[in-house]
Every structure is written in C-alpha cells, then in structure tokens.
Interface confidence: low
C-alpha cells in the first residue's frame, strides 16, 4: 500500500512538475526590468527564452519573438536546450511512469517490470528537474553579472563625470517557476526511484518448487492469476510543447499596429 | 542621467537626401522608444516618427510615410533619421527625443540638429 | 494648420497665474492622455506635464496640467522670468495613428 501511494504521489508531484517546467519555458517573464530609480516614462520591458515584450503603463503590450537562431546569445540558446530536454524527458518519463504505476494493470506485466519501469521514470524526473533548475540557474547567474555590470559607474570623457545606467535587469517569475517546477519535478523522480525498491520483487520469497507426480515433471512457480483492470491505454500524442520561435506571421495580434512604434 | 547627442549641422541640395544621427547613452537603449521631431524656423514641433530598438519596426507620421527612414542600431546605442527628397520646406532643426509614442510623452530630448535644405 | 489649437501668444506679470489652453478632437485629447512642453530658446523641448496632470521629477509644483472633454490647460502659477518660453501640448491622435502637437504659445513674463 505504501509502496503504490509513493509511486502515485511521485507520479504526481512529477507531473505538476513537468506542467511547471512547460509554463516555465513558454513564459515571457525570465527577465523583467528592475524598476528601481527608473524615469516615470520609461517602458516596461520584459523579456523570455523565445520572445522579448515591451508593456506602456496603460497596458499596451506589444511582443517580438526571436526570428534568428545565429544571433542569440550562446547562453540563451544553452538555456533554451536545457529546458526543452527537461520538458522531453520529463514526457517520456511521464508516458512510461503511467504504464509503471501499480494501481494500472495492462496485460500480464510482471512487477518487475514495473520495477524497472518505475526506475526507469525517476532517473528521467530526476535528469529533467535537473536540466530545468540548471537551466533556469544559467539564466539567473546570467541575470546576476548583467545586473551589477549596469549598475557600475561609467566614466565620461568630460570632467570625470559619473553616469549610472539606469535600466537593470532582474529574476522575472518564470524563473521562479522554474526552480519550483525543477525540484518537483526532482523530488517526484526520487519517490519513483523510493516505490521502485519496493515493487521489485524479492528473490528469496518464493523458489521454483518441482512437485513429482504419476512420472509428469511439473514445474510450479507461484504468482498466481493476474486480473486485468481492462484499463485501456490512452497513447494519443498531445501537443506538449509548441515553444519554437514563431514566425513573424505567428506574433499575436494587437489593437493596432500603431499602438506602439 | 540619459543623453541622446545628435550629429552635426547639415547643409543640403533640393532633392538630395540626409541622414541624422543620435547617440543615446546612460540608459538602456534597445526597450525605449526613440521618435523624431521637427521644428521648422518660428514654427511648432511636429512628430515624424519613431522606433523601437528591440524591434527594429518603425512607426511613420502619414505626412512622412515614403520619405523619411528610421533605424536603430543596437550595438552602438544609436538611431538614425534618413530623409530623402529633400525640399526647401525641410529646413528645419531635428530632434531625436526618447519616451512613449503612444501617449505623446518624450522625456529625453537631443539637442537637435539643423538641416538647411538650400540650392 | 496644427491638429491641436493652442492660443499664440499668453502673457502676464510675475507672481500672476497664466493659463494656456489647448483645443483638440474626440480622436486626441477626447480620448488619450495630454502632456505639455516647455521650449525655452535655443533649446530643446523639456517635457513639463504628461499624463494630463502628472509632473516629472524636477517640475516644480507651480506647474499643473488639466483636461476637460476634448479641451485641456496648463497653469503656471507664481510666474517668473524664467518661465518666458514656448509651450506645446501633445496627444496621440486615433485617427491620424500618430503624436500631434499643438501649434504652440508663446508665453512672454512681462
């Protein structure tokens, strides 16, 4: 009992997780300007892994997705990677932690198969909240050197004048998101990886007993009758993740073209 | 404090075209929206367009559509005002002026730049 | 012919109250927000009022904006030499998908 409420509440944890890891990925808020001593009229701007938006105080918020491969930052690409490997892991290991989970009979699958498919999708959880928190953390050490370069004096030629730049960059809340849908995702894989110890079957329960009778050898292995739940399994392929960089045709449509420059 | 520094004065044929340039520094260029304005001699200001670095697009007061250009370029923090098939009418000071467009609000202003349009 | 009508010349004498107006259409001050600018000579504009009523840092409170329907006005309060200059209003205009500006008021402290 306690083995099948691990493995289902690290299924669960896992899937928020995975949910969390998407959204994270698809949010535009990985880096939003740091308000902080900035002029009354300055635009708000706010930028993701895919696209960058720039929102007017009244709400007008136009948004520009990334139309080049080659001139992005290594890092963002590194980023962008990181993420969607997490987000692939994580539906594979999601696809196979179904077939794992022990209240879900299919066929007369062994539970040691089940063992192995239980493994199986922790180590997966494991990697993909990895590649998520390392992901998300590339960006915030990103964050944090830009951060306090802008905020670094600048001399200007003229009297040693001292300028500050006043717009900096800080944690936007998909990166929030992200660590928080990392370590689900981590901790849920590690419950898996728990409730597989307990599904894998133990050797020296039961030995291959040989009962000799009227000259038949018959060979008896207990394990008993396997019911199936009837259970069908649902192996359509849902859109997971749509997060490529758009087309300017795809760019969301606004009140106006003109509502900003 | 922001500075937006624009090119030097220029002396220009009818029919000819001109280019104005403007340095912004002490900000972050690319999220703000950079607009040209114009002032004839003894007259009022007028909008002739504007840009957003980030994205490159520009937007073109109607009068202008077809003759005037304006790009951003990002490395080096400056945009410019092409504007081509010039008249005597051209004659003008031009500022470059950040702020929304939107909303008509310009809180970094250049110091303008004045282009004689004279044969 | 500017879009926005403001008067072309306002005067007064220091301390007095001065107060420009600017007249424009349902498509731009009747509906988007009004800023105001002052131009001192030579100089660039600087930007006095925006958001109808809202003044930047360094505006001294002298200074206020207000609108009314299609119409909007400035104030100057306590007047001063240093206020001599030339005022514009702005609005972005629906119809023309673009700023307009007023023509201007020369204000001139007597």
């Known amino acids: 009992m306690a083995v099948t409420a691990c493995q289902g509440l690290g299924f669960v944890v896992s899937l928020i997780g995975i949910a969390g890891i998407i959204a994270a990925t698809c949010m535009d808020q990985w880096s939003t300007q740091d308000l902080y001593n900035n002029p009354v009229t300055a635009v708000f701007n706010y930028q993701g892994l895919w696209r960058s938006c720039v929102r007017e105080s009244s709400g007008f918020t136009e948004c520009r997705g990334y139309f080049t491969l080659l001139g992005l930052p290594a890092m963002l690409q590194a980023v962008r990677a990181l993420m969607i490997v997490g987000i692939v892991l994580g539906a594979i290991g999601l696809l196979v932690s179904i077939f794992a989970l022990k209240c879900i009979r299919i066929g007369s699958m062994e539970d040691s198969a089940k063992a192995n498919m239980t493994l199986t999708s922790g180590i997966m959880f494991i990697v993909s909240g990895l590649c998520a928190i390392a992901g998300v953390s590339v960006f915030a050490n990103m964050l944090v050197t830009n951060f306090w370069m802008s905020t670094a004096n600048m001399y200007t030629g003229m009297g040693g004048m001292v300028q500050t730049v006043q717009t900096r960059y800080t944690f936007g809340a998909a990166l929030f998101v992200g660590w928080v849908a990392g370590g689900l995702t981590l901790i849920g894989g590690v419950m898996m990886c728990i409730a597989c110890r307990g599904l894998a079957p133990e050797e020296t329960n039961y030995k291959a007993v040989s009962y000799h009778a009227s000259g038949h050898s018959v060979a008896y292995k207990p394990g008993g009758f396997k019911a199936s739940t009837g259970f069908g399994s649902n192996t359509k392929n849902k859109k997971i993740y749509d997060g490529g960089a758009r087309t300017e045709d795809e760019v969301q449509s606004y009140p106006s073209k003109h509502d900003y420059v | 404090q922001v500075q937006l520094v624009q090119s030097g004065a220029e002396v220009k044929k009818p029919g000819s075209s001109v280019k104005v340039s403007c340095k912004a520094s002490g900000g972050t260029f690319s999220s703000y929206a950079i607009s040209w304005v114009r002032q004839a001699p003894g007259q009022g200001l007028e909008w002739m367009g504007g840009?957003?670095?980030?994205?490159?697009?520009?937007n073109y007061a109607q009068k202008f559509q077809g003759r005037v250009t304006i790009t951003a370029d990002e490395s080096t923090s400056t945009a410019y005002m092409e504007l081509s098939s010039l008249r005597s009418e051209d004659t003008a000071v031009y500022y470059c002026a950040r702020g929304f467009i939107r909303y008509g609000v310009f809180d970094y202003w250049g110091q303008g730049t004045l282009v004689t349009v004279s044969s | 012919q500017s879009v926005l009508t403001q008067p072309p010349s306002a005067s007064g004498t220091p301390g007095q109250r001065v107060t420009i107006s600017c007249s424009g259409s349902?498509?731009?001050?009747?509906?988007?927000?009004v800023n105001w600018y002052q131009q001192l000579p030579g100089t660039a504009p600087k930007l006095l009022i925006y958001s109808n009523n809202q003044r930047p840092s360094g505006v001294p409170d002298r200074f206020s904006g207000s609108k009314s329907g299609t119409s909007a006005s400035l104030a100057i309060s306590g007047l001063q030499s240093e206020d001599e200059a030339d005022y514009y209003c702005?609005?972005?205009?629906?119809?023309?998908?673009?700023?307009?500006f007023g023509g201007g008021t020369k204000l001139t402290v007597l």
């Open positions: 349902s498509s731009n001050i009747g509906s988007n927000t």
């Open positions: 840009i957003i670095p980030i994205f490159g697009t520009a």
């Open positions: 702005a609005a972005w205009d629906d119809r023309f998908h673009h700023v307009v």
